[in-house]
């Protein structure tokens, strides 16, 4: 792959350059000082001169006036002001607002439900395969294999709690040691961040929205990947997570607690259980090498069963095979013993759509995968539309200021930590980091939350999901309590360690810069987002898995050269941006490489060729749907469905994304045309709440 996308005629710029104050700020900037605000109350930002040592020298000449794509958009309010309305108008507007709120909550409900169904669909499609990943004996000795198994399994079942509960049951059954379980937990942490990245893909329609949404989602991915990159070798070398958690578990005499409260599930379960119900024990049984489980279906058929535990007499070859000497007898010819047998009597069938279809798991999973993605996409579009119409003018200003403004000096640094607590608290309430971060994604997309503010919220979400796991561990039965608690604590301390690495010092907030860089690339080349998803969550883990199966020698033989090349490229990039003069003239830029190795443009041409035909067809369909939609809602200007068609023409435009040095991954200048920004819709009579 290209060392960096778009490095065409890059020339190091030795001169200092101008950059928006908001640009480099790792914490959320004060939006009252933001650029491109139309509100005349807000002063334009003063440009600050930054030395290359802080921000890195650009690889191309930049214009002095930069229109930062990361600045939050101002949603113009074209409606009649509240004060100018008559009584009838005010009442109408009030009920319109109530209606929108109900609609928003409704779509949000179905959005969360579709995430749950999506998880079930993934489990049906890949759950058994995921279970089989765990039954690999090499996990014990190879932490890298454990890591990728954690990633793959969590991606396949779309639930880190499912993969961690499998790990817990394997540890409590002595099939796995805590030491071997830690890399799997790290992998599960990575795997769980795919959900909100998928959700971000749903906002692909609008370039600027997609840029923000995708960056906001992938900030979670980068945090997890970077944390693992640093902490896995540290853990392998020192076993600090294992030691700390062991000390904690041994020093406290924990009593079995109660289950963590299911707050969100209480609302969503009545609906989701009508769609499908799964027997998640099957995956765990496969992971624990239960041969019978391999032929079991994950789709739950019987919901009400009567389990009768009885002791039956069975013959045994000799008294040595008896359950115990006191439970051994003879009938004069054969030896007998008493065995505990559980008779399961099916009483009532489950009440879900697939209960009587008797379809294979793959078929049910595929159906649900398609449907849940459609619902997810539809709900997301509607949520964004409703939020777009509600969050306008002063409402948007108030909300944005509340969320994105820091505490007054000298407590500004505390804001991020409060955001971490809020993220943890919210995740604890909804009982799922995927749900919380997925709900956050469209808000980042439409510009309500900055990436700088979303980052600590996401980190808090990572902590929140581990506190849920700790509570669940405390509710475990006696034999599983120690192992499940230790694993939950490992997960907790791993995330704490990650936060300490990538949050307290603004300079170390690499995930934000990397996510913004990826956001810029993906906004320009939208196929790259899917490519990134496949590479990072499937291909790399599967490659490592395959190489690990081949043995240590193969893994090292392939891995070391790859790692060496990556380090070489990164060092070269660093030198190119920081001190290019120390390099030979040829190495001061990437022009010595063929275009396909330094730019995504040739790749884009290939992808466009493949998708062009499909895109055209999709576009016609989209236009037809759109016209119908617009006629129904009687708003000829509100519908931007056919945007994809405009993008087809837009794709022909020749401008490339100028890319800067590695560590400024942000502030990449992209024209408004490339951003695909469009003015806010001016529908008939929009309400302004304030």
């Amino acid at each position: 792959m290209a060392p960096w996308p778009e490095l065409g005629d890059a020339q190091p710029n030795p001169d200092k350059y101008l950059e928006g104050a908001a640009g480099q700020q790792p914490t959320a900037p004060d939006k009252s000082k933001e650029t491109n605000k139309t509100d005349n109350t807000e002063a334009p930002v003063t440009k600050i001169e930054l030395l290359p040592s802080y921000s890195t020298a650009t690889l191309i000449d930049e214009p002095t006036e930069v229109d930062d794509p990361w600045n939050l958009p101002t949603l113009q309010d074209s409606g009649i002001k509240w004060s100018e309305r008559d009584t009838k108008g005010k009442i109408l507007c009030f009920f319109q607002g109530i209606g929108r709120l109900i609609l928003l909550l409704g779509f949000l409900y179905f959005f969360v439900c579709s995430l749950d169904i999506l998880s079930s669909a993934f489990q049906l499609v890949g759950g058994k395969m995921a279970g089989q990943f765990f039954s690999n004996s090499s996990i014990m000795s190879n932490p890298l294999l454990g890591l990728v198994i954690g990633v793959l399994v969590t991606v396949l079942v779309q639930s880190s709690s499912t993969s961690t509960s499998i790990v817990v049951s394997m540890v409590s059954s002595s099939l796995l040691t805590v030491r071997a379980a830690i890399p799997i937990i790290m992998g599960a942490n990575i795997g769980t961040s795919i959900t909100n990245t998928i959700v971000a893909l749903m906002q692909v329609g609008d370039r600027s929205e997609f840029r923000r949404a995708f960056a906001g989602a992938t900030v979670h991915d980068f945090f997890n990947w970077l944390s693992v990159l640093v902490l896995l070798p540290v853990e392998v070398a020192t076993h600090y997570l294992e030691i700390i958690t062991q000390l904690i578990v041994e020093s406290f005499h924990f009593k079995n607690g109660e289950d963590a409260p299911d707050l969100l599930k209480v609302i969503t379960k009545p609906f989701t259980k009508l769609i499908v119900q799964l027997d998640k024990k099957v995956i765990s049984q496969i992971a624990m090498n239960d041969e019978k489980a391999k032929n079991k279906s994950l789709v739950k058929i019987w919901c009400k069963t009567f389990t009768n535990k009885t002791q039956i007499n069975v013959t045994v070859p000799s008294t040595a095979n008896c359950t115990s000497p006191s439970l051994c007898w003879t009938d004069g010819i054969q030896n007998w013993t008493m065995k505990n047998v559980t008779y399961k009597e099916n009483i009532a069938k489950c009440q879900h759509i697939f209960v009587n279809f008797h379809l294979p798991d793959l078929a049910v999973g595929t159906i649900l995968l398609i449907l849940s993605l459609l619902v997810l996409c539809g709900c997301l579009i509607m949520i964004v539309k409703i939020l777009g119409s509600v969050l306008k003018g002063q409402v948007a200003t108030v909300i944005k200021k509340t969320i994105n403004t820091d505490f007054p000096f000298p407590f500004a640094w505390l804001t991020g930590y409060l955001a971490i607590l809020v993220g943890a608290g919210m995740t604890f309430i909804v009982q799922s980091s995927s749900v919380f971060t997925s709900a956050l994604t469209p808000l980042i997309g439409i510009g309500v939350i900055t990436i700088e503010r979303a980052y600590p919220l996401t980190l808090g979400s990572n902590i929140g999901t581990t506190t849920t796991a700790i509570l669940a561990a405390l509710a475990s039965p006696g034999n599983a309590l120690r192992s499940s608690l230790q694993i939950a604590l490992c997960h907790f301390f791993f995330n704490i360690s990650g936060i300490l690495l990538w949050y307290p010092i603004p300079f170390t907030r690499l995930p934000i810069r990397m996510a913004k860089g990826l956001g810029n690339i993906s906004a320009k080349y939208r196929w790259f987002a899917v490519f990134y998803l496949i590479i990072f969550f499937f291909l790399i883990p599967l490659t490592v898995f395959g190489l690990s199966l081949a043995g240590w020698r193969v893994l090292v033989g392939v891995g070391v050269p790859v790692v060496f090349i990556i380090i070489l490229v990164l060092c070269l990039r660093l030198l190119q941006s920081r001190c290019p003069r120390v390099l030979p003239k040829k190495l001061q830029n990437w022009n010595f490489l063929p275009l396909w190795m330094r730019s995504l443009k040739p790749w884009d041409a290939v992808v466009s060729k493949f998708t062009g035909c499909f895109q055209m067809r999709c576009c016609c369909c989209c236009r037809v749907c759109c016209r119908a939609c617009c006629l129904l809602c009687d708003c000829p200007k509100c519908c931007r469905c056919s945007k994809c068609c405009e993008d087809l023409e837009e794709a022909q435009e020749g401008q490339d994304v100028p890319v800067k040095a590695p560590e400024t991954f942000d502030n990449i200048t992209i024209s408004r045309e490339a951003q695909g920004e469009v003015p806010a819709s001016d529908s008939k009579t929009e309400c302004t709440a304030l």
């Epitope: 006191s326 051994c328 007898w329 003879t330 009938d331 010819i333």
Partner: antibody, heavy 119, light 107 residues
């Protein structure tokens, strides 16, 4: 009802053999073990062995192995015990008893066959 | 072989009395113990199996208890027809063995 009817008394000379029968009725002959128990005059009970008529499997008390042979005829629902090389201490009442399914308690007993070994 | 020792060997009691017979096994037999009643000139009759379970048709004045190596057989209120010889039997392992018997006589 379950009934076990044994053959009549036998008087035999030392060294000779004797074969006694136990005809059953009132239950499925092949599902329960058939035990044979010896009771010498004024003595306690002594287990000789058992046969499972369903398969013909047998088990013997080591003390009687080689001198007692247990057989069963499924067609007539009859169990047999043959005692060979009889000595005077073999004088006793021999009972056949039905074993309860799955364990060694004997719920129904025959009336007994008296064997007297005398020269 | 597992030895069973019954005590007492002889027992004199009156109608209405409560009578207890014990049976000790030379090793752990769990609860694989049965109790039989035998009247003179008759074949034995099963009363109790699994140490405590009464056989069908056996009056509830007969009861059994114990596990492991010590077992007791109790007649809560002696009736005239209860005077007979009582045997314990283990079926924990082959060969099946019986106690030497306890003869219950009228006082």
């Amino acid at each position: 009802q379950v009934q076990l009817v044994q053959s009549g008394a036998e008087v035999v000379k030392p060294g000779a053999s004797v074969k006694m029968s136990c005809k059953t009725s009132g239950y499925t002959f092949t599902t329960n073990n058939m035990h044979w128990v010896k009771q010498a005059p004024g003595q306690g009970l002594e287990w000789i062995g058992a046969i499972y008529p369903g398969s013909g499997a047998t088990a013997y008390n080591q003390k009687f192995k080689g001198r007692a042979t247990l057989t069963a005829d499924k067609s007539t629902s009859t169990a047999y015990m043959e005692l060979s090389s009889l000595r005077s201490e073999a004088t006793a009442v021999y009972y056949c008893a039905r074993g309860m399914y799955g364990h060694g308690a004997m719920d129904y007993w025959g009336q007994g066959t008296s064997v007297t070994v005398s020269s | 072989d597992i030895q069973l020792t019954q005590s007492p060997s002889f027992l004199s009691a009156s109608v209405g009395d409560r009578v207890t017979i014990t049976c000790k096994a030379s090793q752990d037999v769990g609860t694989a113990v049965a109790w039989y009643q035998q009247k003179p000139g008759k074949s034995p009759k099963l009363l109790i199996y699994w140490a405590t379970t009464r056989h069908s048709g056996v009056p509830d004045r007969f009861s059994g208890s114990g596990s492991g190596t010590e077992f007791t057989f109790t007649i809560s209120s002696l009736q005239p027809e209860d005077f007979a010889t009582y045997f314990c039997q283990q079926y924990s392992s082959n060969p099946l063995t019986f106690g030497q018997g306890t003869k219950l006589e009228i006082k």
